[in-house]
Interface confidence: low
C-alpha cells in the first residue's frame, strides 16, 4: 500500500520544510523548571519505540510508521549509555541508580555507588547515593512515584531506596544474616527513608504481615501479606500524615485524587505487579494514564512544584516473555500516559524527560510491506522454506525445535497476543540488550539533552534544571509568576 501523495517529491519537501521551520523556532529556555517529570519505559529500546509507533498507527487504521507517538513530539533527543560499572548489559537496579541518582552502580544494586557489592549487606553503609526525588523533597517540592510494576520494584526503588539486592522486596526476602546486620527490605524503606506524597502501583503483599488476606483475592493465600516482622506498613505510613489516604482499587483512587483533604496518597492495586494493560480489569485497576493523572492532580497543588517518576514497567516483562504483543501494548499505554501528562502540565514550567533504563534483544526487520501488520510475517520464506515474523528476539523462550527444525508460523498465529516470537538462542527469559537508548526532553533546560551521554547525565540535567543539589547556584531565572 503506497499512498499516492507520497509518490510526489513535493510531499516530502513540504513536510521537511515544515519540520525545519519548527526546528528554527526552537529557543532554549533560560528559566528553571518548577516541576520535573521522568517517564521511564522499562526495556523500551529504540526498536520497541519504532514498533510501538507502527502499532499505534495501525490501531487507528493508518499504515503505521508515519504516526507520531507523544514522545516523538518532544523537541530534544539524546542517546544514553546504559552499561553498569560491572556489566556491559545492565539490569533495572543499576540503571535506576544512574538516571535517578546520577551515579553508576553495580548490577542488581539500587541507590548505592559501585563500592557496594551485590548481596553483601555490610557494603551498604557509607555507599548510599541520594536521588533527585529526595533532593526535590528537601527543596520543598511534592514528590510521587507511579508504576505498573510493584512500587518496590527496581526502577521506582531507585528514587527512595538503598539496597545491595533488588529482590529484597519485603523482610521475608532478606536473609536473616542481612536483617541482623541492619539491612532493610525495600518496602520498609519506601515508608521510612523519605516522605513520598504519592505512591501508586502494585505491591500490596509486601506491606502486610504474613497471613493477612488480600482484599481483592482473599481466598488466594499466595496473594496475601508476606511480612515476617508482623508490621502493617500501610498503617504505619497512614499514621505519619494527617491527610494520608490508602486505596486499593480504581474507584477509590479517582475519589481520593479529587478530595482536597487528601495530602498523601498510596494506591496499591495488585498484590504484586499490576496486570498487563490487555488483561486489566478496568473496574478494579486503574490504567497507567489514570494513575499519572491522579498523581498530577495531587502533586500540582504545591506552589513550589513537584517531582514525578512515571514508569511503564511491564514493557520489560513482555519482552522477557518474548511476547511482543504485550510489550508493545504496554508501550502504547505508557505513551498515552505521556500524552495525558502533557495536557495537564505546561512546558513553560515543567521539564519532562522520557527514556528507557535499557533495551532488549528485540528486532524488527525482514522487509515487510508498508501497512502490513507489525505482528505479521516477512514477505517470502527463510532458507528453511518456512515463514518468519518481522519481530524476532536474539534469545529467549521463543526458541522451539519441532523434530529438530524451526516450526513454521502463520499470520494468525503470530497475531495472537500470547504468541512468543522466535529466537536464535533458547533461554527461559529473554535478556536485556546493551545498546544506547533514547532520551526525549521537553520544557525548561530540555536543550541540555543532546548528544551521546552517560545515563547518569539524566539525573544531573533534572537537578540542574530545578536548581537542586548540587546545582543550587544554577543561576537560572525562576519562571515569571512562580510563587514560593
Amino acid at each position: 500500500i503506497i499512498p499516492v501523495e507520497e509518490e510526489n517529491p513535493d510531499f516530502w519537501n513540504r513536510q521537511a520544510a515544515e519540520a525545519l521551520g519548527a526546528a528554527k523556532k526552537l529557543q532554549p529556555a533560560q528559566t528553571a523548571a518548577k516541576n520535573l517529570i521522568i517517564f521511564l519505559g522499562d526495556g523500551m529500546g529504540v526498536s520497541t519505540v519504532t514498533a510501538a509507533r507502527i502499532l499505534k498507527g495501525q490501531k487507528k487504521d493508518k499504515l503505521g510508521p508515519e504516526t507520531f507517538l507523544a514522545m516523538d513530539r518532544f523537541p530534544y533527543v539524546a542517546l544514553s549509555k546504559t552499561y553498569s560499572v560491572d556489566k556491559h548489559v545492565p539490569d533495572s537496579g543499576a540503571t535506576a541508580t544512574a538516571y535517578l541518582c546520577g551515579v553508576k552502580g553495580n548490577f542488581q544494586t539500587i541507590g548505592l555507588s559501585a563500592a557496594a557489592r551485590f548481596n553483601q549487606c555490610n557494603t551498604t553503609r557509607g555507599n548510599e547515593v541520594i536521588s533527585v526525588m529526595n533532593r526535590a523533597k528537601k527543596a520543598g517540592k511534592s514528590v510521587g512515584v507511579v508504576t505498573t510494576t510493584r512500587v518496590q520494584h527496581a526502577s521506582p526503588a531507585g528514587a527512595y531506596a538503598h539496597t545491595v539486592n533488588r529482590n529484597w522486596y519485603s523482610d521475608a526476602d532478606v536473609p536473616a544474616s542481612a536483617r541482623q546486620e541492619g539491612c532493610q527490605d525495600i518496602a520498609t524503606q519506601l515508608i521510612s527513608n523519605m516522605d513520598i506524597d504519592v505512591i501508586l502501583g502494585g505491591g500490596r503483599k509486601y506491606m502486610f504481615p504474613m497471613g493477612t488476606p488480600d482484599p481483592e483475592y482473599p481466598d488466594d493465600y499466595s496473594q496475601g501479606g508476606t511480612r515476617l516482622d508482623g508490621k502493617n506498613l500501610v498503617q504505619e505510613w497512614l499514621a505519619k500524615h494527617q491527610g494520608a489516604r490508602y486505596v486499593w482499587n480504581r474507584t477509590e483512587l479517582l475519589q481520593a485524587s479529587l478530595d482536597p483533604s487528601v495530602t498523601h496518597l498510596m494506591g496499591l492495586f495488585e498484590p504484586g505487579d499490576m496486570k498487563y494493560e490487555i488483561h486489566r480489569d478496568s473496574t478494579l485497576d486503574p490504567s497507567l494514564m489514570e494513575m499519572t493523572e491522579a498523581a498530577l492532580l495531587l502533586l500540582s497543588r504545591n506552589p513550589r512544584g513537584f517531582f514525578l517518576f512515571v514508569e511503564g514497567g511491564r514493557i520489560d516483562h513482555g519482552h522477557h516473555e518474548s511476547r511482543a504483543y504485550r510489550a508493545l501494548t504496554e508501550t502504547i499505554m505508557f505513551d498515552d500516559a505521556i500524552e495525558r501528562a502533557g495536557q495537564l502540565t505546561s512546558e513553560e514550567d515543567t521539564l519532562s524527560l522520557v527514556t528507557a533504563d535499557h533495551s532488549h534483544v528485540f528486532s524488527f526487520g525482514g522487509y515487510p510491506l508498508r501497512g502490513s501488520s507489525i505482528f505479521g510475517l516477512a514477505p517470502g520464506k527463510a532458507r528453511d522454506r518456512k515463514a518468519y515474523t518481522v519481530l524476532l528476539y536474539g534469545n529467549g523462550p521463543g526458541y522451539v525445535l519441532k523434530d529438530g527444525a524451526r516450526p513454521d508460523v502463520t499470520e494468525s498465529e503470530s497475531g495472537s497476543p500470547e504468541y512468543r516470537q522466535q529466537s536464535a538462542v533458547p533461554l527461559d527469559g529473554e535478556t536485556h540488550a546493551g545498546e544506547d537508548v533514547a532520551v526525549f526532553a521537553r520544557g525548561p533546560q530540555a536543550h541540555l539533552v543532546h548528544g551521546v551521554q552517560e545515563q547518569t547525565f539524566i539525573a544531573h540535567v533534572m537537578a540542574f534544571a530545578a536548581c537542586l543539589e548540587p546545582y543550587t547556584a544554577c543561576d537560572l531565572a525562576p519562571r515569571a509568576g512562580t510563587t514560593d
Partner: nanobody
Framework: QVQLVESGGGLVQAGGSLRLSCAAS????????IGWFRQAPGKEREFVAR????????RYDDSVKGRFTVSIDNAKNTAYLQMNSLKTEDTAVYYC???????????????WGQGTQVTVSS
C-alpha cells in the same frame, strides 16, 4: 470483526447442568474479554460472568458464584459457560459477548452473539 455463535442451550430440570459454547470466527479472541450475559422475559439484560482470554481475571455475578464457571479454549477459539446446580430463576436467553478496553468507557462489549435459550423447569 468478530462473529459469535452460541450453542448448548435447552430445557433442563432444576439442579441439572448445561454447558454453553460461544464460538468466535473472523478473528481470534486475542485481547478480548469474554462476557456472558442473560435476559429473562420482561427483564433487562444482566451480567453473568466474564473472563480475560488468558484467565488472569475472572468475575462472576453473586447470583451464580460457585455454580457457574467460564472458560476459554484459545486453540478452538471458543468460550464456555459451565452451569451447574441450575435454578428456575436461571431461565433466560444467554448471550456471549467479546469486549475490549476503551479508555473512555472502560471495558465494553462490541460484539454479541444471537443468544441461546436456557429453560430450567421445576
Amino acid at each position: 470483526q468478530v462473529q459469535l455463535v452460541e450453542s448448548g442451550g435447552g430445557l433442563v430440570q432444576a439442579g441439572g447442568s448445561l454447558r454453553l459454547s460461544c464460538a468466535a470466527s473472523g478473528r481470534a479472541f486475542g485481547d478480548y474479554n469474554i462476557g456472558w450475559f442473560r435476559q429473562a422475559p420482561g427483564k433487562e439484560r444482566e451480567f453473568v460472568a466474564r473472563r480475560t482470554w488468558d484467565g488472569s481475571s475472572t468475575r462472576y455475578d453473586d447470583s451464580v458464584k460457585g455454580r457457574f464457571t467460564v472458560s476459554i479454549d484459545n486453540a478452538k477459539n471458543t468460550a464456555y459457560l459451565q452451569m451447574n446446580s441450575l435454578k428456575t430463576e436461571d431461565t433466560a436467553v444467554y448471550y456471549c459477548a467479546a469486549g475490549r478496553y476503551s479508555r473512555v468507557r472502560g471495558w465494553e462489549y462490541d460484539y454479541w452473539g444471537q443468544g441461546t435459550q436456557v429453560t430450567v423447569s421445576s
